[in-house]
């Protein structure tokens, strides 16, 4: 039988290249059993992680997987940076690995590439 510990499965050292002006959903996969924990997002600023109080978030339940989503509608150039999700569960604070967004400002690009083109160009 699976343990009922809360776990946050943001992939270690994960990175996402995204375009300013596009919508984007940053996913925090959350494993829990009976009671859904309270989850928050923060953005790293040096060694501290600043809680994102005023951002749109939501839960998504999909094929027995739960996600706590941070919405970027749209992505802005200053969304560039590293993010972490945290869960409060039975008085314990559980922190995820950080995930980094690399934002390309399309204003400076002469021709707007497709998402898939940009991803392959950015990461290849």
């Amino acid at each position: 039988k699976e343990s009922c510990d809360v776990q946050l499965y943001i992939k270690r050292q994960s990175e996402h290249s995204i375009l300013a002006g596009d919508p984007f959903e940053l996913e925090c996969p959350v494993k829990y059993c009976a009671n859904r924990p309270h989850v928050t997002w923060c953005k790293l600023n040096g060694t501290t992680c600043v809680k994102l109080e005023d951002r749109q978030t939501s839960w998504k339940e999909e094929k027995n997987i739960s996600f706590f989503i941070l919405h970027f509608e749209p992505v802005l150039p200053n969304d560039n940076g590293s993010y972490r999700c945290s869960a409060n569960f039975q008085s314990n604070l559980i922190e995820s690995h950080s995930t980094t967004l690399y934002v390309t400002d399309v204003e400076s690009a002469s021709e707007r590439p497709s998402k898939d083109e940009m991803a392959s160009r950015f990461w290849a």
Partner: antibody, heavy 118, light 111 residues
Framework: EVQLQESGPSLVKPSQTLSLTCSVT????????WNWIRKFPGNKLEYMGY???????YFNPSLKSRISITRNTSKNQYYLQLNSVTTEDTATYYC????????????WGHGTTLTVSS | DIVLTQSPASLAVSLGQRATISCRAS??????????MHWYQQKAGQPPKLLIY???NLESGIPARFSGSGSRTDFTLTINPVEADDVATYYC?????????FGGGTKLEIK
């Protein structure tokens, strides 16, 4: 039911480029992580890399200068390209999906066997 | 890279007996708060098949004869009792750290 199917050449000449396709049904490649793995004739399994739900990629550093992984979301396919192949790249190539809760490979393709030979 | 050392490399077990396969990691596998160590079975001509995920969780549809245990650097796959259909090569895999790595495999045969 999630299904993955690899396709591509069975024979490639040294120094050429290998291109493989993984066609996915039963799930969208805009969720989870989609991987390439290969198995050498001596039975060693090597992890090659992934493309994520957002389109970002990770490559095994041992292959980084030669590999790219791309996708076509409208076809629900992702692709492996391996440049400058040698006989050492002779292997069976698998595509597989990683589960979000721990990244284990819960669905695999049947594999496609590649021989690199002149 | 995290190196996974499997032992033994091959194993011959009588039907109905217990088979135990060990996987030792060169670094601790626990950065997610649990152990991202998994076990696969591969039969000739087939892709690997997930048996155990996150050290001790039995994949859906896999018989309860298969079990996994361990933490940190030492992990074990146990098959009890062994059946004729279990003839295969078994691999451990870690997904705690990139690049993911596999053990060298353990070939199980019937004595």
């Amino acid at each position: 039911e999630v299904q993955l199917q690899e396709s591509g050449p069975s024979l490639v000449k040294p120094s050429q480029t290998l291109s493989l396709t993984c066609s996915v049904t039963g799930d969208s490649i805009t969720s989870a992580y989609w991987n390439w793995i290969r198995k050498f004739p001596g039975n060693k399994l090597e992890y090659m890399g992934y493309i994520s739900y957002s389109g970002s990629t990770y490559f095994n550093p041992s292959l980084k200068s030669r590999i790219s992984i791309t996708r076509n979301t409208s076809k629900n396919q992702y692709y492996l390209q391996l440049n400058s192949v040698t006989t050492e790249d002779t292997a069976t190539y698998y595509c597989a999906r990683s589960h979000y809760y721990g990244y284990y490979f819960d669905y695999w393709g049947h594999g496609t066997t590649l021989t690199v030979s002149s | 890279d995290i190196v996974l050392t499997q032992s033994p490399a091959s194993l011959a077990v009588s039907l109905g007996q217990r088979a135990t396969i060990s996987c030792r990691a060169s670094e601790t596998i626990d950065s997610y708060g649990d152990s991202l160590m998994h076990w696969y079975q591969q039969k000739a001509g087939q892709p690997p098949k997930l048996l155990i995920y996150r050290a001790s969780n039995l994949e859906s549809g896999i018989p309860a004869r298969f079990s996994g245990s361990g933490s940190r650097t030492d992990f074990t796959l146990t098959i009890n009792p062994v059946e004729a259909d279990d003839v295969a090569t078994y691999y451990c895999q870690q997904t705690d750290e990139d690049p993911y790595t596999f053990g060298g495999g353990t070939k199980l045969e019937i004595k």
